[in-house]
């Protein structure tokens, strides 16, 4: 049925970038400026997205594809297809309802977007803090305290033979 219908439907011959113009005996007319059709057989063209205000044009609207927007400097995209622009903050900050706020002690953010995240807890991995964390940087974990004790070899000893039935850590 679909095949029969498409053979009879003159609109199915209209390629992307055109629309099936009922006012002109179903002839395929080009999409007018500031509109597009991304698929064939369409009876109307869609209006192009306008990148205004905090948005800026990344790619113009063509007859077959919508415009692509980006955010002006100082803002970054959020959502599918950059549907929103969110204010950038400095590294070491996060965006709150009251604007950009410094990360609390024990957290960091190394980007201009996103939230402050807790410093890595080195002791959970049996390691020690080699470099302290800041608002902008995570801590750097170093060898475990035992590895740093006097008399400890600086050469890594060979790994012990793995016991059967134990999975690697």
């Amino acid at each position: 049925f679909e095949r029969t219908r498409s053979l009879q439907d003159p609109c199915s011959n209209c390629p992307a970038g055109t629309f099936c113009d009922n006012n002109r005996n179903q002839i395929c007319s080009p999409c007018p400026p500031n509109s597009f059709s991304s698929a064939g057989g369409q009876r109307t063209c869609d209006i192009c997205r306008q990148c205004k205000g905090v948005f800026r044009t990344r790619k113009e609207c063509s007859s077959t594809s919508n415009a692509e927007c980006d955010c002006t400097p100082g803002f970054h995209c959020l959502g599918a297809g950059c549907s929103m622009c969110e204010q950038d903050c400095k590294q070491g900050q996060e965006l709150t309802k009251k604007g950009c706020k410094d990360c609390c002690f024990g957290t960091f953010n190394d980007q201009k977007r996103g939230i402050c995240r807790p410093w890595t807890n080195c002791s959970l991995d049996g390691k020690s803090v080699l470099v302290n964390g800041t608002k902008e940087r995570d801590v750097v974990c170093g060898p475990s305290p035992a590895d740093l004790s006097p008399g400890a070899s600086s050469v890594t000893p060979p790994a012990p033979a793995r016991e059967p039935g134990h999975s690697p850590q």
Epitope: T18, P33, T57, E60, T64
Partner: antibody, heavy 114, light 112 residues
Framework: SVEESGGRLVTPGTPLTLTCTVS????????MIWVRQAPGEGLEYIGF?????FTYYASWAKGRFIISRTSTTVDLKMTSLTVADTATYFC????????????WGPGTLVTVSS | DVVMTQTPASVSEPVGGAVTIKCQAS??????LAWYQQKPGQPPKLLIY???TLASGVSSRFKGSGSGTEFTLTISDLECADAATYYC??????????????FGGGTEVVVK
């Protein structure tokens, strides 16, 4: 209006920057385009900087040509010039938010010869 | 790359006659095509864009049509001032920041 400048006789390998100066409209509201035409030949689309400040280049021009802008000028920086780059270089404004050039400058001639 | 093949290379018609110029794209470009007129020693002039939209200040004697890969420029009621070279040009985006906004080879129109 649109007007190009900076065209001159250079030797192969010499870098050259062309400048497009506009008046009567705001550059950052339009696509600003560079096109060239070798003597007696057809038109060749080089690339453009769009209203958002993003640059696009023809595949043959990418890496050798750089388009940039200020509030009143658009530059075309050209490197590794060869005799084949001898042409009149046109700057133009895009029509209606597109990269179709509609307002053209008179062009500036670049001659590359040893 | 998108190749634009323009025919004929040259055409001669009398005043009051009509000229048809064809442009074929090597792949579908929707309706992203423009037509330009260029006279010796002058920059090109945009006549038509989006395949059929007349540019500002251009005579309605110029008519563009077509979509996909086949496009036509028709100049009716020819005048001496129409003697020029005519170019088609597509808009086509590749990957990243590469474009294939290719011009056709041009058609010289002689008005007798």
């Amino acid at each position: 209006s649109v007007e190009e400048s900076g065209g001159r006789l250079v030797t192969p390998g010499t870098p050259l920057t062309l400048t497009c100066t506009v008046s009567g409209f705001t550059i950052n509201s339009y696509h600003m385009i560079w096109v060239r035409q070798a003597p007696g030949e057809g038109l060749e689309y080089i690339g453009f900087i769009n209203d958002g400040g993003f640059t696009y280049y023809a595949s043959w021009a990418k890496g050798r040509f750089i388009i940039s802008r200020t509030s009143t000028t658009v530059d075309l920086k050209m490197t590794s010039l060869t005799v084949a780059d001898t042409a009149t270089y046109f700057c133009a404004r895009g029509v209606d938010g597109t990269s179709y050039p509609d307002l053209w400058g008179p062009g500036t001639l670049v001659t590359v010869s040893s | 790359d998108v190749v634009m093949t323009q025919t004929p290379a040259s055409v001669s018609e009398p005043v009051g006659g009509a000229v048809t110029i064809k442009c074929q794209a090597s792949q579908s470009i929707g309706s992203d095509l423009a037509w330009y007129q260029q006279k010796p020693g002058q920059p090109p002039k945009l006549l038509i864009y989006r395949a059929s939209t007349l540019a500002s200040g251009v005579s309605s004697r110029f008519k563009g049509s077509g979509s996909g890969t086949e496009f036509t420029l028709t100049i009716s009621d020819l005048e001496c001032a129409d003697a020029a070279t005519y170019y088609c040009q597509c808009i086509y985006y590749g990957s990243d920041d590469v474009i294939y906004h290719t011009f056709g080879g041009g058609t010289e129109v002689v008005v007798k």
